[in-house]
């Protein structure tokens, strides 16, 4: 598939407003509700909100011979979670990152929280239509990783998962292990 557009979105929105009925407003809304943030402590004495950096991606899906009729919207969960007051500085990697590294022995990463199975149609060059199910990410969350190396290390492979801040019940809807495997 190819990427059409990607926009940066911070996960401050708690509940999205559904699109109004419209023949043009056909892209799927996040089935599992809004994005969210976690309340967590930077250290024992400080409590701040942790924001998750999310990218909203628009993609066309292809199986080689056929391409999706409409682009598909989904979230890409990227990078670190940061205290909300320093989020604006995050992109430049300046004050916010230093603040976070100095004050915490743990890393908070933005990871997939909820997915759902989406049925889509693909239009083929011979005029026929196909249908598939794919799995899309609908929400991200902050997950805590414990540093196993020195405090300034940002080698994420060297981190081990720790207990998440919040538990979000997964939907029962079946999902595939490969994000865009089609069935």
């Amino acid at each position: 598939f190819k990427n059409d557009a990607t926009e940066i979105l911070y996960s401050h929105v708690v509940k999205p407003v559904p699109a109004h009925p419209s023949s043009n407003s056909t892209l799927n809304q996040a089935r599992n509700g809004g994005r969210h943030f976690s309340n967590t402590g930077l250290d024992r004495n400080t409590r701040v909100q942790v924001g998750c950096r999310e990218l909203r991606s628009t993609k066309y899906i292809s199986d080689g011979q056929c391409t999706s009729i409409s682009p598909l919207k989904e979230l890409v969960c990227a990078g670190e979670c940061l205290p909300l007051p320093v989020l604006p500085n995050w992109i430049g990697g300046g004050y916010g990152t230093k603040y976070w590294s100095r004050r915490s022995s743990q890393e908070w990463r933005c990871v997939n929280d909820k997915t759902r199975t989406q049925r889509i149609q693909l239009q083929c060059q011979d005029g026929s239509t196909r249908t598939y199910k794919i799995t899309v990410v609908t929400a991200c969350k902050c997950k805590r990783y414990t540093r196993q190396h020195n405090e300034s290390s940002h080698n994420f492979e060297s981190m081990s998962p720790a207990k998440p801040v919040q538990h979000h019940r997964e939907r029962k809807r079946a999902s595939k292990s490969s994000k865009h495997s089609m069935s």
Partner: antibody, heavy 123, light 107 residues
């Protein structure tokens, strides 16, 4: 015009099997998932499962996994549901229903339904 | 499985009335709620999908609303041809599940 034409009523004996057909026309058969729904007086409407005519892959409601088998014949644009080991509890009207898509995206609604096939299980 | 409840199993109304039929889900279904009309002869038609979007060919007197777990179908100006049973269905989680139906009758 989209049409889903189901096979006629069936009177079958307990323990037997039955195969219901749903012949489609007016649209690209492989472009739409097909669901099957059971309607009985006691249980209202129950979703049995769905099949992808492109791949032949199917997903079942756990309750009907041992009861129903969904298949398709792409050459005739027809969907089938076989029900086995029939008992009186399987007596019902069965519908095929097409998945609705809006500019290529599904909202998990069924936009066109067959007229229903009555299955009566009686000795 | 998600349970869908239509508390009113039958409803009497007069022609021209505004009628509202409600449906409640046992958990949040994130607006993946459809409404169907079943005529006495068994014919089933989709009216509304994704809570409030009107399926093509459906008269504009039908409308849907709701969020979370509570949803409703409204017929703004009841006509004779609207006499039928109405079912809600959630599509948020497999298996898809239906409400028990609300039978609409003329007073």
């Amino acid at each position: 015009e989209v049409q889903l034409q189901q096979s006629g009523p069936e009177l079958v004996k307990p323990g037997a099997s039955v195969k219901i057909s749903c012949k489609t026309s007016g649209y690209s058969f492989t472009g739409y998932y097909m669901s099957w729904v059971k309607q009985s007086p006691e249980k209202s409407l129950e979703w049995i499962g769905e099949i992808n005519p492109t791949t032949g892959g199917s997903t079942y409601n756990q309750k009907f996994k041992a009861k129903a088998t969904l298949t398709v014949d792409k050459s005739s644009s027809t969907a089938y549901m076989q029900l086995k080991s029939l008992t009186s509890e399987d007596s019902a009207v069965y519908y095929c229903a097409r998945e609705g898509y809006y500019s290529g995206i599904s909202y998990d609604a069924m936009d066109y339904w067959g007229q229903g096939t009555s299955v009566t299980v009686s000795s | 499985d998600i349970q869908m409840t239509q508390t009113t199993s039958s409803l009497s109304a007069s022609l021209g009335d505004r009628v509202t039929i409600s449906c409640r889900a046992s958990q949040d279904i994130s607006n993946y709620l459809s409404w169907y009309q079943q005529k006495p002869d068994g014919t089933v038609k989709l009216l509304i999908y994704y809570t409030s979007r009107l399926h093509s060919g459906v008269p504009s007197r039908f409308s849907g609303s709701g969020s979370g777990t509570d949803y409703s179908l409204t017929i703004s100006n009841l006509e004779q041809e609207d006499i039928a049973t109405y079912f809600c269905q959630q599509g948020n989680t497999l298996p898809r599940t239906f409400g028990g139906g609300t039978k609409l009758e003329i007073k």
